[in-house]
């Protein structure tokens, strides 16, 4: 007599999550009578996934009319496949008794499933940074399987080399995770500069997933201030101009102070953007020499962003060379500069 | 090739919780069982139980009430936990991988952590 | 619970000369697939235990030939056909039938 054969032809099968998997399996007799079940595993933990004689098994249904006479094809369909239904699947032939005795296994099928990475979510830095500092971004994705998988960053179109990537779990698993970091080295010309994490998968045939991320969100770009006189004009009133450019973002409050005293302040609101997406924003002081006795000491204070204040201070000389006229510049941008502008009456 | 590799205290005090881990390494967690076994100092082997990788768990019913595995496939590493432990629990605690592909039986322990040393005392 | 029963429980042996150690199983371990789930380990003196052989006659990977097994049911053989100074430790025979999983009280082999 013939030896039962279990035949699953397949060592393994692979199936897009959401799609449907066939396990096949056959005998090679129809004696002795005795029904087939299906198991996930082996060993005492193994699970019942289908029992073709009796249960209620939702997602499971036999290819073939398992109570057709003479069927020697015992494969299964399983519908609407997640991760989860990864595993080493076994067609078992039982004997008929009570209870049915296990006869032979199948040399069992791994499912294997194919499930797409969810889009990249890159996120930067808590705080800005300014220009010529180093920030991190972070880009996540989850739920692929298999676990092989490409991350690329890109600046500018740019791909970036100062990246680390984990994938984890480190063994096998039913789905895996992404994350990875990217360095990025800010310029003052970052504001329109975008970062993006590419992920390539076998699931998104070709066709890679991006997350971008703005520097505009995590970049602070410093003003520069320069203060200038405009002439004197007829009526003994000095025009002087505090000049704040090249900053980024658009917050910035800026108060001119007469000998320690707030004169005036004042909050940048709807400035047109330079081209690098940087703003610029001029204010004036006019000052009446006439008014004063002694010399008096502007400063022009600018809070940009939250960040310590930038003075620059000027003094205004009210008695001496009243002809004497000019331009001063302070051009730093940090800390107190002071400058002389002399004026009085002729 | 897979690699076991048991952590945790040497020195465990009388009717404390004893505590070890096992790492594995170079292999997969899947469709093997994990299994822990203890040698008492000059004495043969004793099965304390095992873990299937899909969670389910089987002890050795002489031990079964102070005994807990778990396992965390996410990093690939399996726990012993023994509790009210006694002078009788002092032993040499190995992890290992249990093979299975024929039915309701079991095809060998076919991977084996060095074993790490258990001393109850106070 | 199966209860497992070597014999001897010390072999002195001669290098070159083949040796044989028992076990016996308190009920059978064959399997109704035809399986005997019964596992034969050896463990070298400071090592942790090594699988020889598993279902009864199938050597393990890496295992040299010239250990074998046999048995069916509850009777149950491990035959080294010519012994090496490397085969002295402790071998044990374990079932793995059903939980929870037992050992025999092992079989000392040593040189002469």
């Known amino acids: 007599e013939e030896e039962l054969q279990v035949i699953q032809p397949e060592k393994s099968v692979s199936v897009a999550a959401g799609d449907s998997a066939t396990l096949n399996c056959t005998v090679s007799s129809l004696i002795p009578v005795g029904p087939i079940q299906w198991f996930r595993g082996a060993g005492p933990g193994r699970e019942l996934i289908y029992n073709l004689k009796e249960g209620h098994f939702p997602r499971v249904t036999a290819v073939s009319d398992p109570t057709k006479r003479n069927n020697m094809d015992f494969s299964i369909r399983i519908s609407n496949i997640t991760p989860a239904d990864a595993g080493t699947y076994y067609c078992v032939k039982f004997r008929k008794g009570s209870p049915d005795v296990e006869l032979k296994s199948g040399a069992g099928t791994e499912l294997s499933v194919r499930a797409k990475p969810s889009a990249p979510v890159v996120s930067g830095p808590a705080v800005r940074a300014t220009a010529e500092h180093t920030v991190s971004f972070t880009c996540e994705s989850h739920g692929f399987s298999p676990r092989d998988i490409t991350l690329k960053w890109f600046k500018n179109g740019n791909e970036l080399s100062d990246v680390q990537t984990n994938v984890d779990p480190a063994g096998k698993s039913v789905s895996y995770s992404i994350r990875s970091t990217a360095r990025v080295l800010l310029t003052r010309r970052d504001v329109h500069s975008q970062v993006i994490c590419e992920v390539a998968h076998v699931t998104l045939q070709g066709d890679p997933l991006r997350g971008t991320a703005n520097l505009s969100e995590a970049i602070r770009v410093p003003p520069f201030l320069e203060v200038t006189q405009q002439s004197m004009r007829a009526d003994n009133q000095v025009n002087v101009t505090c000049q704040v450019t090249k900053f980024y973002p658009q917050r910035l409050q800026l108060t001119w102070l007469e000998n320690g005293n707030v004169s005036r302040t004042e909050m940048a609101s709807a400035l047109p953007e330079n081209k690098d997406g940087t703003y610029n924003w001029t204010s004036w002081l006019l000052v009446n020499v006439s008014a004063h006795r002694d010399d008096v000491k502007l400063t022009c204070q600018v809070e940009h962003d939250g960040q310590p204040a930038v003075n620059k201070s000027f003094s205004v000389k009210v008695s001496a060379h009243p002809k004497e006229q000019g331009s001063n510049t302070a051009a730093e941008n940090t800390g107190t500069n002071e400058r002389n502008i002399y004026g009085g009456s002729g | 090739q897979v690699q076991l590799q048991e952590s945790g205290p040497g020195l465990v005090r009388p009717s404390e919780t004893l505590s070890l881990t096992c790492t594995v390494s170079?292999?997969?967690?899947?469709?093997?069982?994990w299994s822990w076994i203890r040698q008492p100092p000059g004495k043969g082997l004793e099965w304390i139980g095992f873990?299937?990788?899909?969670?389910?768990?089987f002890y050795n019913p002489s031990l079964k009430s102070r005994v807990t595995i778990s396992l965390d496939m996410s990093i690939n590493q399996f726990s012993l936990k023994m509790t009210s432990v006694t002078a009788a629990d002092t032993a040499v605690y190995y992890c290992?991988?249990?093979?299975?592909?024929?039915?309701?039986?079991?095809?060998?322990?076919?991977?084996w952590g060095q074993g790490t040393t258990v001393t109850v005392s106070s | 619970d199966i209860v497992m029963t070597q014999s001897p429980l010390s072999l002195p042996v001669t290098p070159g000369e083949p040796a044989s150690i028992s076990c016996k199983s308190s009920?059978?371990?064959?399997?109704?697939?035809?399986?005997?789930?019964l596992d034969w380990y050896l463990q070298r003196p400071g090592q942790s235990p090594q699988l020889l052989i598993y279902?009864?006659?199938n050597r393990a990977s890496g295992v040299p030939d010239r250990f074998s097994g046999s048995g069916s049911g509850t009777d149950f053989t491990l035959k080294i056909s010519r012994v090496e100074a490397e085969d002295v430790g402790v071998f044990y025979c374990?079932?793995?039938?059903?939980?929870?999983?037992?050992f025999g009280g092992g079989t000392k082999v040593e040189i002469k």
């Open positions: 279902q009864g006659s």
């Open positions: 009920q059978s371990l064959l399997y109704s697939n035809g399986y005997a789930y």
């Open positions: 873990i299937y990788y899909n969670g389910r768990t």
């Open positions: 374990m079932q793995a039938l059903q939980t929870p999983l037992t």
């Open positions: 290992a991988r249990v093979r299975a592909y024929s039915g309701i039986g079991l095809d060998g322990t076919d991977v």
């Open positions: 170079g292999g997969s967690i899947r469709n093997y069982y």
